[in-house]
Every structure is written in structure tokens, then in C-alpha cells.
Amino acid sequence: QLPPGKPEIFKCRSPNKETFTCWWRPGTDGGLPTNYSLTYHREGETLMHECPDYITGGPNSCHFGKQYTSMWRTYIMMVNATNQMGSSFSDELYVDVTYIVQPDPPLELAVEVKQPEDRKPYLWIKWSPPTLIDLKTGWFTLLYEIRLKPEKAAEWEIHFAGQQTEFKILSLHPGQKYLVQVRCKPDHGYWSAWSPATFIQIPSDFTMND
């Protein structure tokens, strides 16, 4: 029977800069029941606070709701593991909410084959930003990536789309079914998960090249 091993705060993420969650990995438990607590203070303050919500983010997590989240302050946090034989502390982690945003995937992905009379046909891909993100405030710049592949192909083809919420692909294999997905990230943050795939059947008379 031993004191607990050193825990590690390994990830903090925010869906929209308004709330965030941090997760830790327990160290060894020393063969005894172990309690974990996360404490934090804001940079420039000495007053320590305990995690406001251990439930929302699941096991070994701390969730900071709106009233506890400030974009303009750095949070300094650590996890304390305690059992009957003693305690151990994680390293301090410095968290700036601006840099941990991982949005939900974009919404309303629509894919359409366009065949204008006077120009080459193309695949038109369109989507909307995730609902939790308020782009009107100017706090966010969302960047997008599209990926597509023929249904039976092994490798995806990825395209960086910048800020635009639409994309055109000209050359595709006629008669094939393509999968298309989109994801987003803020300019200082993490890529969202890929959106659910949308399937599109390319007509067999689709002109392959430009």
C-alpha cells in the first residue's frame, strides 16, 4: 500500500470560449481508494478555488460553466490525488481559453453536382458553421477543411478552404459515389471532428478534366 502516483492534466477543451472542460489521468492508486480534486487560481490572483463541476465532463474531469469562464485570464490549475498513505500533485497547467477551443463539426453539409451549359460540370459543397459559435462578435475566425474520396478508395483528398463556407471541385471520376465531409477550427485552436459524411453519386456523363 502506497501513496497515489502523480496525476496528469492531459487535455482542456472549449466548444466556444464560453465554457471549458479539463481532463486528467490518474497515477497509480497505491492499492487504496483515492480521491481527486482539481484546484485553480487565475493569473494575478492568489485565492485558490476548487473545481466547480466534477460531473458534466465525465470521470476525471472538471467542467467550468459560463460563470467560471473568462477569456481574458489565464487559469493555473493542478490536480491533487489523496489516499490513506498520502498525497501527490500534478504539475501545474496554464490554460488560456482562447487557445483550447475545439468547436462542434459544421452543420448542414450539402453536396450537389452542377452542370452549367456553358462551363465544365463541378461538385458544389456548402455548409454552415456550428450553432454554438457566434461569428458575429468577431471573437472567432473559423477555418474549414473538406475531405472527399470515392466510396471504395482508401485515401481521402483533403482541401483547406479558409473561411469560406462553400467549395468547388471540378475533376471527379464519372459514375462513382463520393463521400464528402467538412470540419472547422478557430484560428487559434483545434480541429473539430469531421461532420457526418454526405454521399453524392457522380453522373456517368460528368466531364473528368478541366
Epitope: Y122, R147, E155, W156, E157, I158, H159, F160, G162, Q163, Q164, F167, K168, I169, L170, S171, D210
Partner: antibody
């Protein structure tokens, strides 16, 4: 017929400024991304900057960030590159290039030479 | 440091097949971003030769082909001709740089 014509190059002292232009004709200018790519004498190609169709989104190579500004005027079918605080290592032929679906550079201008020397 | 590595030179005799490689990393080619190839004939502006890994623009002969696997891409030229003597560049977007990367270029000589 697609035509791209760069202008504005020339001889400039270190620390000086130049504004390059790229006049486009023969297609709908506003429908495309646009790039600037440069090539130092006897060297390879180096991407400098690109700008999205909506003008609000731009990217720059680290070597020019904070010194160069890309812009476009869709009403004049013209792409620009404002180059400030020029250095000897900015000496190159500067090409404008049109960006199609994967922002591939499908048409290039003939280039304009920028020489930075004291 | 993100780079696309190409051999500085390649050569072949007329009629031969030549391959030029372009090796990247997990932040560009290996990430899944597409690769484009450009041909620059002596004294001229670059020209798009292959786009999105393996597509040919109209007007480019089918002697030119592209492929991509993992963190590398290749340009193959079959039935080599004297007019193929040029510099060849690969290019791909890079996620960590948030910018385009060009390979260093390969000078192809037709012997």
C-alpha cells in the same frame, strides 16, 4: 483567353517599398483565389501569399509576414502586393497566379522583377 | 521544419520513362492534402502540369502522370522528349505553416 499581367517591379533600396499589380482579363476575376509566388535568381519557387475570393481571408509565408500585404479589387480585376521594409533577400521575379478548386495555380503571369540593393 | 524534398536533378534519354519524387511529412502530403506539379521551361513562367495528385489539365499529354502514397508523391514522364527538359516542382498546403510549400525543384535533362 486568360491573361495575367504583372507590373510595379523595379529597383529599390533596402527598407524601401513597392506595390505590385496583376491585371487579369478573359474570365471572371472575382470567382478565384489569387496567389503571389516568387523566384529568386537561379533558385526555386517560393509561395508568398494568397487571398480568398471574399478578400477577408489571407495567408502569408513566414518570411514576409508583417511586411507584405495582399489585396484585390474585384471591380478592377486586379490583384496587388504591397511590399514594405524590403530586404536584399526579397530580390526575385514575382508571379501572380490564379487559384482554382484546390487552390491549384492554374494560370500564371509572366512575372515582374524586384531588385533590392543599396 | 516543414519541407517537400525533391531530387535536384534527373535525366533520361528520349523515349525513356523518368520518375521524380516529392517527399513531405505528416503536416502536408501525409496529412492528406493534395499535391500539384508544375513545369517551368527555361526562361518562362511555371505551368500547371498535374493537379490534385493525379489529374491532368487539358492540353497536358498523357505521357505525364502523378501519384501519391503516404507522405510522398511522384511525377512520372514516359516517352521522354527533348521538349520535356525543364524544372519540375511539387507543391502542397502545409497545416503547421498554414501556407503553401514548394519542393526545391528537379532539373530534368534529356540526354
Amino acid at each position: 483567353e486568360v491573361q495575367l499581367l504583372e507590373s510595379g517591379g523595379g529597383l529599390v533600396q533596402p527598407g524601401g517599398s513597392l506595390r505590385l499589380s496583376c491585371a487579369a482579363s478573359g474570365f471572371t476575376f472575382s470567382s478565384y483565389w489569387w496567389h503571389w509566388v516568387r523566384q529568386a535568381p537561379g533558385k526555386g519557387l517560393e509561395w508568398v501569399s494568397d487571398i480568398a475570393r471574399a478578400s477577408s481571408y489571407t495567408n502569408y509565408a513566414d518570411s514576409v509576414k508583417g511586411r507584405f500585404t495582399i489585396s484585390r479589387d474585384n471591380s478592377k480585376n486586379t490583384l496587388y502586393l504591397q511590399m514594405n521594409s524590403l530586404r536584399a533577400e526579397d530580390t526575385a521575379v514575382y508571379y501572380c497566379a490564379r487559384g482554382l478548386d484546390a487552390r491549384r495555380m492554374d494560370y500564371w503571369g509572366q512575372g515582374t522583377l524586384v531588385t533590392v540593393t543599396s | 521544419q516543414s519541407v517537400l524534398t525533391q531530387p535536384p536533378s534527373a535525366s533520361g534519354t528520349p523515349g525513356q520513362r523518368v520518375t521524380i519524387s516529392c517527399t513531405g511529412s505528416s503536416s502536408n502530403i501525409g496529412y492528406g492534402y493534395v499535391v500539384h506539379w508544375y513545369q517551368q521551361l527555361p526562361g518562362t513562367a511555371p505551368k500547371l502540369l498535374i493537379y490534385r495528385n493525379n489529374w491532368r489539365p487539358s492540353g497536358v499529354p498523357d505521357r505525364f502522370s502523378g501519384s501519391k502514397s503516404g507522405t510522398s508523391a511522384s511525377l512520372a514522364i514516359s516517352g521522354l522528349r527533348s521538349e520535356d527538359e525543364a524544372d519540375y516542382y511539387c507543391a502542397a498546403w502545409d497545416d503547421s505553416l498554414n501556407g503553401w510549400l514548394f519542393g526545391g525543384g528537379t532539373k530534368l535533362t534529356v540526354l
